[in-house]
Amino acid sequence: RVDRCSLQPCRNGGLCLDLGHALRCRCRAGFAGPRCEHDLDDCAGRACANGGTCVEGGGAHRCSCALGFGGRDCRERADPCAARPCAHGGRCYAHFSGLVCACAPGYMGARCEFPVHPDGASALPAAPPGLRPGDPQR
């Protein structure tokens, strides 16, 4: 007889069960309906701490955390400066608007990547409009 499950009637990764008299779909967490076609609101009743935003997907809620926070619910502090993004001894600060570099003397740029020439000029390429040394990168 024909395997009716070969038509993959179950949506969103649901498991198809051919019971002979009927087809059944066993839905993954976060989905419902005869064919698992309904995406439940993963974020309903879920809170992300410290200004994080709940993102639905894959049947499980996920938090997109604000700068400086991490973990499943954004309750853990994360250091955006841990990767040492400021070059040439520049100091990285985790400002709420984005990480900020304060460059060591002799360097400039958003990541302190450009040396300042002795005459005061720099090897800075054309910067994007509005971007100045020390501006945060979000």
């Epitope: 400086g68 502090r77 250091d79 400066c81 040492r84 100091r91 990285c92 600060y93 985790a94 400002h95 709420f96 608007s97 990480l99 900020v100 304060a102 460059c103 003397p105 100045r132 040394p133 020390g134 945060p136």
Partner: antibody
Framework: QEQLVESGGGLVQPEGSLTLTCTAS?????????MCWVRQAPGKGPEWIAC???????TDYASWAKGRFTVSKASSTTVTLQMTSLAVADTATYFC???????????WGPGTLVTVSS | QVLTQTPSPVSAAVGGTVTISCQST????????LSWYQQKPGQPPKVLIY???NLEIGVPSRFKGSGSGTQFTLTISGAQCDDAATYYC??????????FGGGTEVVVK
């Protein structure tokens, strides 16, 4: 809630020494900040003393503070300021403050009073 | 690095405008790493403006900062009684150096 609290102030004799402690709560120095000391003499404006950058432990001092003042990180939540050869002119309220970027102090402790007098 | 504030004291009527200037002997880092603080007796300074013109969270919009390089201004538009305090500018300089201005006392009548 992020807070700073200073302790260790009090009365000290001229030429004496004192160590002040700044204790952080609500955050730790595992992130990168300048943890700084600022003092304010009675009726005067604030005066920057020194900072320690928690990212790598490097320190910076006002030119007048070098030699007599030493800032250090004692733990993940405390920084200290050691003061030696104190003079009457060092009488002030000593504040602990945090720079979290753009070179400004967005978080301050309430201060601790140091009085140098015989 | 020396920051000079003028004038002091400054007096204003309720609803009036207060302008305080701050001049630095050398350019602050990034040309705009200059902040403004308000201080009342018995309290630590409270930041109002950072990066020359950015209003700190929770600070009323009647406070406005401007300027760059060595010359900066704090303007209080529509001054209120609660604005009576001493105001300080503070700069951050290349080499990780900080400095405060001498302060400007504001009296609101």
């Amino acid at each position: 809630q992020e807070q700073l609290v200073e302790s260790g102030g009090g009365l000290v004799q001229p030429e004496g020494s004192l160590t002040l402690t700044c204790t952080a709560s609500g955050f730790s120095f595992s992130s990168s900040y300048d943890m700084c000391w600022v003092r304010q003499a009675p009726g005067k404006g604030p005066e920057w003393i020194a900072c320690i950058y928690t990212g790598d432990g490097s320190t910076d001092y006002a030119s007048w503070a070098k030699g007599r003042f030493t800032v250090s990180k004692a733990s993940s939540t405390t920084v200290t300021l050691q003061m030696t050869s104190l003079a009457v002119a060092d009488t002030a309220t000593y504040f602990c403050a945090r720079n979290s970027g753009y070179g400004y102090f967005g978080l301050w402790g309430p201060g601790t009073l140091v009085t140098v007098s015989s | 690095q020396v920051l000079t504030q003028t004038p002091s004291p400054v007096s204003a009527a309720v609803g009036g405008t207060v302008t305080i200037s701050c001049q630095s002997t050398e350019s602050v880092y990034g040309s705009d790493w200059l902040s403004w603080y308000q201080q009342k007796p018995g309290q630590p300074p409270k930041v109002l403006i950072y990066q020359a013109s950015n209003l700190e969270i929770g600070v009323p919009s009647r406070f406005k900062g401007s300027g760059s390089g060595t010359q900066f201004t704090l303007t209080i538009s529509g001054a209120q009684c609660d604005d009576a305090a001493t105001y300080y500018c503070q700069g951050y300089y290349s080499g990780y150096i900080y400095a405060f201005g001498g302060g400007t006392e504001v009296v609101v009548k």
